[in-house]
Interface confidence: medium
């Protein structure tokens, strides 16, 4: 969380930004707040990304005005113009790449006075895990796969029942780069499990944290799993 | 009303290049929109080719990017589609559609449609 | 890539009925799916965006529902030209892609 003040005359506003993440080959959102003026012609919005010469975007007297934008960022972001008199100024991102990840600064003047907020935008990938019974191994074993991770994630085994353990002798982990041949298809095989035990799969890198979780019993399969960013908000 | 119109050979030869062109009429191409290619083979479902912006920037499908070039002619307000080394497996009904992007919504939908060419590949 | 699949593949309802097509995505596309329809020697017609959101003109029998990786396209009651075949399409990741269809037939 970043809180930005600034000065005009007597006048600064408050800007607040949050460190985000953006999953490449996604649509992203730059996340960017101010205090309401309900005048919106009087509101300009400007977001600048650190060493690049041209704006990312900007919106002044209720509308779009690319005149200035960068060649990289050419139809590739909205703010949600609607929200803006409400103090909204996020930015929409399309397409997210690798090369997306910088220092953005979300930059906002209104009748109120100016004021100004850097962001931390990072940009990898990231997908939640899937664990299934694997039935076509010779022992009873698990597999854990999600579809799309960047940079390499390291992956960890977990057991409710055998706490502290260390699986990386019974586990095998591959990486399969996928077709845009930037993001990897995450691949890890459990061996030798038992029954009526619930086993996580853990999968981390610099950018997000995603968890698998599978119980297994005599009468049941149940499955969870959650996904969640790192150093965000 | 946006009104999209494809134009284009009808039929291909195996490994030759297929070349269609999209006329956009009641609207600029160089509107905030991405305008894409989209195509259905005949009795199948429908797989989207590439995007384009007024700018030139595009997005192609992996499965295609290798043989795909999508361009826009701002003066004629129209954007074109070329697939070189065509197969029998490129025969389709090729589509041309605008995104729905609208200032503060999402891209992505396809809210204005051409009607349609079919492309067959024989020899 | 991600993969949209449709059920049922075809699915016979009478008219005034209810219909329910489901539409199911490989990973998750948060909100952003679309539902569109083709009637035969036609271009694929936007009914649904957002996931709810009825495209303008779209009468209110239509309506989308879901988020995450499990949709629903349901007509309220049927009218004799809602016939035809129901496509999803998500739009959170390129390359968009479509579901292989729903024919929805009278029964």
């Known amino acids: 969380l970043i809180i930005g003040f600034g000065i005009s005359g007597k006048h600064f506003i408050t800007v607040t930004t949050f460190t985000s993440a953006g999953n490449i080959g996604e649509d992203g959102t730059l996340s960017c707040t101010f205090e309401p003026d309900i005048k919106l012609n009087g509101i300009v919005i400007q977001w600048l990304k650190e060493g690049i010469k041209g704006l990312v975007h900007e919106f002044k007297e209720g509308k779009d005005d690319l005149s200035q934008q960068h060649e990289m960022f050419r139809g590739r972001t909205a703010v949600f113009a609607d929200q803006v008199v409400v103090g909204n100024a996020s930015l929409r991102l399309k397409n997210v790449q690798l090369t997306d990840a910088g220092t953005y600064t979300c930059y906002i003047r209104t009748s109120k006075g100016k004021g100004n907020a850097n962001l931390e935008y990072k940009t990898g990938a990231f997908s939640m895990p899937e664990i299934n019974v694997d039935y076509n191994a010779s022992s009873e074993s698990l597999r854990c796969e999600a579809p799309r991770w960047f940079p390499q994630p390291t992956v960890a085994w977990a057991s409710q029942v055998d706490q502290g353990a260390n699986f990386s002798e019974v586990s095998n982990t591959s990486f399969e780069l996928n077709s845009e041949n930037v993001t990897m298809k995450v691949v890890s095989v459990l061996y030798n499990v038992t029954i009526n035990n619930t086993y996580s799969c853990m999968i981390e890198n610099d950018i997000a944290k995603a968890t698998g979780d599978i119980k297994v019993t005599d009468s049941e399969v149940k499955r969870r799993s959650q996904l969640q960013l790192l150093n965000s908000g | 009303q946006v009104q999209l119109q494809e134009s284009g050979p009808g039929l291909v030869k195996p490994s030759g290049t297929l070349s269609l062109t999209c006329a956009v009429s009641g609207g600029s191409i160089s509107s905030s929109n991405w305008w894409s290619w989209v195509r259905q083979p005949p009795g199948k479902g429908l797989e989207a080719i590439g995007e384009i912006y007024h700018s030139g920037n595009t997005n192609y499908n992996p499965s295609l990017k290798s043989r795909v070039t999508i361009s826009v002619d701002k003066s004629k307000n129209q954007f074109s589609l070329k697939l070189s080394s065509v197969t029998a497996a490129d025969t389709a009904i090729y589509y041309c559609a605008r995104d729905g992007y609208s200032s503060g919504w999402y891209w992505g939908y396809f809210d204005y449609w051409g009607q349609g060419t079919l492309v067959t590949v024989s020899s | 890539e991600i993969v949209m699949t449709q059920s049922p593949a075809t699915l016979s309802v009478s008219p005034g009925e209810r219909a329910t097509l489901s539409c199911r995505a490989s990973q998750s596309v948060n909100s952003n799916l679309a539902w569109y329809q083709q009637k035969p020697g036609q271009a694929p017609w936007l009914l649904i965006y957002?996931?709810?959101t009825r495209a303008t003109g779209i009468p209110a029998r239509f309506s989308g529902s879901g988020s995450g990786t499990e949709f629903t396209l349901t007509i309220s009651s049927l009218q004799s030209e809602d016939f035809a075949v129901y496509y999803c399409q998500q739009y959170n990741h390129w390359p968009y892609t479509f579901g292989q269809g729903t024919k929805l037939e009278i029964k």
């Open positions: 957002g996931a709810s």
